[in-house]
């Protein structure tokens, strides 16, 4: 039985032109993480393999940076980056765990305005 749970940053918003960190954390399992895939809809952004390290997809090399940790940093955000992102943890012996993050990229003034009214 798979006992683990994935905690994510959930629904997040960021400013156009800025950057954002996508973070997931796997807990409540002794399973060993062998690889984490980061995907946007059906597109592979990056892979972090426990043995081979990071691989960033060529089409995202300019705007995606590995880390911190198993997370992923998206830079030079555009409105087109709005959407769902998935962290896919490949583990042994549990198998695959998937976490979902929704990112909304806002025009600068909207993002600033929204930030004032965020619930802490």
């Amino acid at each position: 039985m798979m006992t683990g749970t994935i905690e994510t940053t959930g629904n997040i918003s960021a400013e156009k032109g800025g950057s954002i960190i996508l973070q997931c954390h796997l807990s409540s399992t002794t399973a060993q993480v062998t690889q984490v895939n980061w995907e946007q809809q059906d597109q592979l952004l990056a892979i972090c393999n426990a043995d081979l390290g990071w691989h960033i997809s060529p089409s995202f090399k300019d705007r995606v940076a590995p880390g911190p940790g198993l997370g992923l940093t998206l830079q030079s955000l555009t409105v087109n980056d709005t959407g769902e992102y998935f962290c896919i943890y490949h583990t042994y012996p549990d198998g695959t765990y998937t976490g979902r993050i929704f990112l909304e990229v806002l025009e600068s003034s909207v993002a600033e305005h929204g930030a004032r009214f965020q619930i802490p």
Epitope: M2, T3, A31, Q32, D51, Y92, P93, G95, T96
Partner: antibody, heavy 115, light 105 residues
Framework: QIQLVQSGPELKKPGETVKISCKAS????????MSWVKQTPGKGLKWMGW????????TYADDFKGRFAFSLETSASTAYLQINNLKNEDTATYFC????????WGQGATLTVSS | QIVLTQSPAIMSASLGEEITLTCSAR?????MHWYQQKSGTSPKLLIY???NLASGVPSRFSGSGSGTFFSLTISSVEAEDAADYYC????????FGGGTKLEIK
């Protein structure tokens, strides 16, 4: 290339102890769990459990709790299976296998328990 | 613990024949892996994660299925395919099927 090399055949008497080794090479040892599988003559495969090579924490399948112990010598990239108080029914081939979808297995270590 | 049942236990096939080996799970599993084992050797991975062909495995082997029913198909049996075949799942508590012995007529 990736290899798992196990120790040689063992002939033991009931009540004795055996320690089977599995030396890994060609990859970062602590990146993948190591599991152990038992195969009795002419029978199928039975998962015994696994050890997290990063944390050193072992997990045993229900039928292998008590007399069985998994351990590591991380500096030598080696995993061990120890069986205490051997019984005739422990006669089998024991495989180590890397915990991923790569399909990497040791060649098997044959244990014969006989008085 | 998920019990895997393979059928048939023994199968006899002619050269060039297409055959399908099945593996049913007592409860739903996300992925199935298939191994081939010849006498005196360690199991060899054929298919991983239900339908992916392992490196170096001939394309006559294929896998499919979902939930509680999975299958391994050999599109055109060759003499070297005589072996035992096992399905294997993880899902927290790994288990193997009882195996299917493939004999060539």
């Amino acid at each position: 290339q990736i290899q798992l090399v196990q120790s040689g055949p063992e002939l033991k008497k009931p009540g004795e102890t055996v320690k089977i080794s599995c030396k890994a090479s060609g990859y970062t040892f602590t990146a993948y769990g190591m599991s152990w599988v038992k195969q009795t003559p002419g029978k199928g495969l039975k998962w015994m459990g696994w050890i997290n090579t990063y944390s050193g924490v072992p997990t045993y399948a229900d039928d292998f709790k008590g007399r069985f112990a998994f351990s590591l010598e991380t500096s030598a990239s080696t995993a061990y299976l120890q069986i205490n108080n051997l019984k005739n029914e422990d006669t089998a081939t024991y495989f180590c296998t890397r915990g991923d979808t790569g399909g990497y297995w040791g060649q098997g270590a044959t244990l014969t328990v006989s008085s | 613990q998920i019990v895997l049942t393979q059928s048939p236990a023994i199968m006899s096939a002619s050269l060039g024949e297409e055959i399908t080996l099945t593996c049913s799970a007592r409860s739903s599993v996300s992925d199935m892996h298939w191994y081939q084992q010849k006498s005196g050797t360690s199991p060899k991975l054929l298919i991983y994660s239900t339908s992916n062909l392992a490196s170096g495995v001939p394309s006559r082997f294929s896998g499919s299925g979902s939930g509680t029913f999975f299958s391994l198909t050999i599109s055109s049996v060759e003499a070297e395919d005589a072996a035992d075949y096992y399905c294997h799942q993880w899902g927290g508590y790994p288990t193997f099927g009882g195996g299917t012995k493939l004999e060539i007529k």
